[in-house]
Interface confidence: low
């Protein structure tokens, strides 16, 4: 019977998750006389195979980061090896899984901020990359501050934009940072994929050293 897994030779598109060890055939093409065998060409990468009887399958896990689409062609041949049908395009779309970790571009960042700077105004960006598809949660990154040292009165002086990695002062930081009291701070920043929303997300951390500089501008006396 013809159905999801079998049918005549025609252009088709299949979606397969990367990383999936082979666990089913892709399709069984049915030969119409005088066709007796099938031939596969294109971007097979020695992964995609078609048996003479028309059974199309793959023999090892796909990797989207190596090739996100495999463009194949299938032709039906007669007993003399002459193409009698096709070749028709068969497209394999490789769907993304979360198989790559986000990685900070630097293991250590350094920056400076002037005391009394406007809260929310970025003075430093941390940046991470993830090879997974950014159009899926697998490649969507979420930045956060894990530790601020020193932490005075349990008050956070720094904040980070969870999506962009932009570091800026909080309202308290803008008001209270004083290089005479504490000229430097260290932040540990983490980045998670899956938009930070999954216990299965991967993460990375980086260190940020921040120097607080004196605000040399003085308000004019009345």
């Amino acid at each position: 019977q013809e159905g999801k897994f079998s049918g005549p030779l025609k252009p088709m598109t299949f979606s397969i998750y990367e990383g999936q060890e082979p666990s089913q055939i892709i399709f069984q093409f049915k030969a119409n006389p005088p066709a007796v065998t099938f031939e596969l060409t294109g971007e097979t990468d020695n992964i995609f195979v078609i048996e003479r009887e028309g059974l199309l399958y793959y023999n090892r896990a796909l990797d989207r980061e190596t090739r996100s689409t495999h463009n194949l062609q299938v032709a039906a041949l007669d007993a003399n090896g002459i193409i009698v049908e096709g070749p028709v395009p068969i497209t394999i779309k490789v769907k993304d899984i979360n198989d790559n970790r986000p990685t900070f571009l630097q293991s250590k960042y350094e920056g400076s901020v002037r005391q009394n700077s406007r809260p929310g105004k970025p003075f430093l960006y941390v940046n991470a990359t993830d090879l997974d598809d950014p159009a899926t949660p697998n490649g969507q990154l979420y930045y956060q501050i894990v530790i601020q040292l020193p932490m005075i009165n349990n008050v956070m002086y720094f904040q980070i934009n969870n999506k962009t990695g932009a570091i800026s002062l909080t309202r308290e930081g803008s008001q209270e940072l004083n290089p005479a009291k504490n000229p430097s701070y260290n932040l540990v920043i983490s980045v998670k994929d899956m938009g930070g929303q999954s216990e299965n997300s991967f993460s990375d951390t980086t260190s940020v050293d921040i120097i607080v500089t004196e605000n040399i501008w003085k308000a004019p006396k009345p």
């Epitope: 998750y17 999936q20 060890e21 082979p22 666990s23 055939i25 023999n59 090892r60 896990a61």
Partner: antibody
């Protein structure tokens, strides 16, 4: 809690058939493929085949192609394996095991012992 | 089919001892999976995707390897680790298991 509850032990005569069941609970049945594995007494494991999670397509180890038939009833979250033309070589413990493409067979049934004897 | 050969077939280790068992594949495979089985019970997923520990598996276990050579290591043997360990490949049909390594406590 994920559970795979298999039917009880079977004592059958040579040449007969037997149908083993594996009832799943604690997860969405159609999200996972169900595999079947044979373990002869004191021996290693042999993969029989699997039934694809939501449409009944199945794949077999060629060795068992004419021995086992795998079916599924999604409405009752139950997978079945029928063994036919039984001989003493088929006496073994048969396991069902849940499988997702990432991460091997993570939950196994308790096993069903099949003894073929006249 | 891909044949998985486990060695040794039987081994014993004292508590605290480091244990390594190997699994050799007749052809290159993508990942190796390992199961633990104790007498009278079902196999349990132990290590999957070559090196990932299944839920509840102690951190003293580790898995490694690539191509045709894989291994399971216990950094410090404990009595509860005794059992039979099977390697398993799903990279090529038919899926196959190794003959098992029976690990006993001295």
């Amino acid at each position: 809690e994920v559970q795979l509850q298999q039917s009880g032990p079977e004592l059958v005569k040579p040449g007969a058939s037997v149908k083993i069941s594996c009832k799943a609970s604690g997860y969405t049945f159609t999200d996972y493929n169900m595999h079947w594995v044979k373990q002869s007494h004191g021996k290693s494991l042999e993969w029989i085949g699997y039934i694809y999670r939501n449409n009944g397509y199945n794949g077999y180890n060629q060795k068992f192609k004419n021995k086992a038939t795998l079916t599924v009833d999604s409405s009752s979250s139950t997978a079945y394996m029928e063994l036919r033309s039984l001989t003493s070589e088929d006496s073994a413990v048969y396991y069902c095991a849940r499988n997702y493409w990432r991460g091997a067979m993570d939950y196994w049934g308790q096993g069903t012992s099949v003894t073929v004897s006249s | 089919q891909i044949v998985l050969t486990q060695s040794p077939a039987i081994m014993s280790a004292s508590p605290g001892e480091k244990v390594t068992m190997t699994c050799s594949a007749s052809s290159s495979i993508s990942y190796m999976h390992w199961y633990q089985q104790k007498p009278g019970t079902s196999p349990k997923r132990w290590i999957y995707d070559t090196s990932k520990l299944a839920s509840g598996v102690p951190a003293r276990f580790s898995g490694s390897g690539s191509g045709t050579s894989y291994s399971l290591t216990i950094s410090s043997m404990e009595a509860e680790d005794a059992g039979t360990y099977y390697c398993h490949q799903r990279s090529s049909y038919p899926w196959t298991f190794g003959g098992g390594t029976k690990l006993e406590i001295k």
